[in-house]
Interface confidence: low
């Protein structure tokens, strides 16, 4: 019994002063509290508890069920106990057969004892199954059989509490333990896409899975820099004892441009969390924005090969795509294809293949696309770079000589004097006159320039020599000179091509 | 009772090496976050690395990088620092401490042991 | 690295007064943040966690706020037991400590 110390409040005292007792079923139990500020008795038992406001406890004849612990209380809240163990060799456990273990943890199997004297107080596999070799447990008659860190492969573990009464074994009734697993990783978290565009008035709707071992992850949709609620629907399936699904999908029926942002699905154990977002873009409608991958403006030589090649952005799905040149449209030389396979694609490539081009082929070259909302188009201007061509080459009746040449870029005529039978014609004479006729062709043509120069000029028998050229290459024609007295005569001009 | 008790401190060299350990009792020790946290003498608290509950996942501090490793072994309750290359730095008492969590990913020390002495002089 | 700094690094205070300990983040650290009281040639102490939550065991007389990247300690009625150094700590990307903050007898 607690020592009394003067002028401070002290416990009451039980009589019989033992912290324990034994009686045997049948018998009176008769416990008696003694303190000038009694308040009252409380008995417990498992998830049993009585009160009684008398300061004598009498139970006339004893259960095994009042088997307990017998708490007496004052007004200053402090109390004294005392175990009564009311021994029933017919009911030699009390039983809460609920048993729950949280992975780790220890957990209590309920089977405490009304007679404390018998001996071997243990745990037993039922139907003479051994219990798993690492299973530890402590024994306390007054509370039940403590399973030490419960492990997750013990879920389902069918056991008894077990003591040995006259040298036999005595089970109790049967547990089965049901294992809560402890979270050890965050929870594992996907989207169904990882991006929407919709326009208005579309359904929004994602689905984000959130994988754990037990029903108790929590999970929720949020909107980035957004308090609201948002509205979603779960389900949920448990594949296999620590193998849970759930399936949270966010559903907005009719998506506005406001709706746009992102969201997040969340999810979090008592480990740690995860998260995944994914983006809403809403469009008031349709867009096709094009993004020419080479210059607008394409220069190439004769002959050689182009490639003109397009990115376009297309939502809803491009419908009709074309390539255009001088209003005909390309029926093959072109191809059209998504830049990915993945289904939330909206970018697109065309490219159009010009070969062995001529001179007479430069212009506009425009592509067309168009979806259900909009139309878009790009033009190239394609430019032929040609070796300059001399096209007239004459002695003119006022003596003028006159050199017109076409090419692209537009030609530069020079002049040279060769005298007498020498073979280079490094003398420059200037023209007289320099032109840039408008050519007859399409504009990207060739470009025609005329130049002139006085033949009076020239005194002795020789070679004029006509050079035009451009950055592509150069080409020449000749005039040839003979002095018969006074009079100069033309002889046949004549040409030779310079690459 | 929950308890944490340091070993393995002592006297050592420039460029010596150490192996601190920490025996853990009164809780299930495999189901928690464990760090070596460390104080230098008259100064502050410096946290030095930390290990995850099955030892996969390992963070240090800068400093500490490539010379010092955490371990632990469960079936043992134990925590480990092997320090490699110490320099006078390191000299320091450094103390075990159980992390414990609040909500997410977020960490908090909340049992340390008494600590050990660890001083590097010539 | 987020640095914390604690102000004032040692303070005099009477016992039964209210004594305020300041920490600050150099960068957001949400409400990650700890409190630690140290005692010489002991090892430190969790007062409080996640900003304002209360350690078990520890006296209501010890409270933490604030969010972001600046924090209080509290200690409403200095007690006698209380004269120790105490420590903030982030716990948002890695861990850091504060450098301190003394609290002496006047």
């Known amino acids: 019994q607690p020592s009394v110390s003067p002028g401070e409040p002290s416990p009451p005292s039980i009589h019989p002063g033992k912290s324990d007792l034994i009686v045997r079923v049948g018998d009176e139990i008769r416990l008696l509290c003694t303190d000038p500020g009694f308040v009252k008795w409380t008995f417990e038992i498992l998830d049993e508890t009585n009160e009684n406001k008398q300061n004598e406890w009498i139970t006339e004849k004893a259960e095994a069920t009042n088997t307990g612990k017998y708490t007496c209380t004052n007004k200053h809240g402090l109390s004294n106990s005392i175990y009564v163990f009311v021994r029933d060799p017919a009911k030699l456990f009390l039983v809460d057969r609920s048993l729950y273990g949280k992975e780790d943890n220890d957990t209590l199997v309920r089977c405490p004892l009304t007679d404390p004297e018998v001996t071997n107080y243990s745990l037993k596999g039922c139907q003479g199954k051994p219990l798993p070799k690492d299973l530890r447990f402590i024994p306390d008659p007054k509370a039940g059989i403590m399973i030490k860190s419960v492990k997750r492969a013990y879920h389902r573990l069918c056991l008894h509490c077990s003591v040995d009464q006259e040298g036999k074994s005595v089970l109790s009734e049967k547990f089965i333990l049901k294992v809560r697993p402890a979270f050890k990783a965050v929870p594992v978290v996907s989207v169904s896409k990882a991006s929407y565009l919709l326009r208005e008035g579309e359904e929004f709707t994602v689905t984000c899975t959130i994988k754990d071992v037990s029903s108790s992850v929590y999970s929720t949709w949020k909107r980035e820099n957004s308090q609201t609620k948002l509205q979603e629907k779960y389900n949920s399936w448990h594949h296999g004892d620590f193998n849970y699904e759930r399936q949270a999908t966010l559903t907005i029926s009719s998506a506005r441009v406001n709706d746009s942002g992102v969201f997040m699905c969340y999810a979090n154990n008592t480990f740690g969390s995860a998260n995944v977002t994914t983006t809403l873009e809403v469009v008031d409608k349709g867009f096709i924005n094009i993004f020419p991958m080479i210059n607008t403006t394409v220069f190439v030589n004769d002959g050689e090969n182009v490639d003109l090649i397009v990115e376009y952005e297309a939502f809803p799905k491009p419908e009709h795509q074309q390539w255009i040149y001088m209003n005909r449209t390309f029926t093959d030389k072109w191809e059209d294809y998504p830049k990915s396979e993945n289904e939330s694609n909206i970018r697109y490539v065309s490219e159009l293949h010009l070969t062995r081009l001529k001179g007479t082929e430069g212009g506009t070259y425009t592509f067309l696309v168009s979806n259900s909302d909009v139309n878009a188009a790009i033009a190239f201007n394609v430019y032929v770079n040609t070796k300059p061509e001399i096209l007239t080459y004459d002695r003119l009746v006022n003596g003028m000589l006159q050199c017109v040449a076409a090419g692209f870029p537009e030609p530069t005529i020079d002049w040279y004097f060769c005298p007498g039978t020498e073979q280079r014609c490094s003398a420059s004479v200037l023209p007289v006159d320099v032109q840039t006729l408008n050519s007859s062709g399409p504009p990207f043509g060739k470009l025609v320039v005329q130049s002139s120069i006085d033949s009076s000029a020239f005194k002795h028998n020789g070679t004029v020599e006509c050079k035009a050229y451009n950055d592509v290459g150069k080409t020449s024609a000749y005039f040839n000179f003979a002095f018969k007295g006074n009079n100069k005569e033309q002889i046949h001009p004549h040409t030779l091509f310079t690459p | 009772e929950v308890q944490l008790v340091e070993s393995g401190g002592g006297l050592v060299q420039p460029g010596g090496s150490l192996r601190l350990s920490c025996a853990a009792s009164?809780?299930?020790?495999?189901?928690?976050?464990m760090a070596w946290v460390r104080q230098a003498p008259g100064k502050g608290l410096e946290w030095v690395a930390n290990?995850?509950?099955?030892?996969?996942?390992?963070y240090y501090l800068d400093s500490v990088k490539g010379r010092f490793t955490i371990s632990r072994d469960n079936a043992k309750n134990s925590l480990y620092l092997q320090m490699n290359s110490l320099r006078a730095e390191d000299t320091a008492v450094y103390y075990c401490?159980?992390?414990?969590?609040?909500?997410?990913?977020?960490?908090?020390?909340?049992?340390w042991g008494q600590g050990t002495t660890v001083t590097v002089s010539s | 690295d987020i640095q914390m700094t604690q102000s004032p690094s040692s303070l005099s205070a009477s016992v039964g007064d209210r004594v305020t300990i300041t920490c600050r983040a150099s960068?957001?650290?949400?409400?990650?943040l700890n409190w630690y009281q140290q005692k010489p040639g002991k090892a430190p102490k969790l007062l409080i966690y996640?900003?304002?939550r209360l350690q078990s065991g520890v006296p209501s007389r010890f409270s933490g706020s604030g969010s972001g990247t600046d924090f209080t300690l509290t200690i409403s009625s200095l007690q006698p037991e209380d004269f120790a150094t105490y420590y903030c700590q982030q716990g948002r990307r890695l861990w850091s400590f504060g450098g301190g903050t003394k609290v002496e007898i006047k």
């Open positions: 401490a159980r992390g414990d969590y609040y909500g997410t990913t977020y960490w908090y020390f909340d049992v």
């Open positions: 009164g809780f299930a020790f495999s189901g928690y976050y």
């Open positions: 290990i995850n509950y099955p030892g996969s996942s390992t």
């Open positions: 996640y900003t304002s």
């Open positions: 960068q957001s650290i949400s409400s990650y």
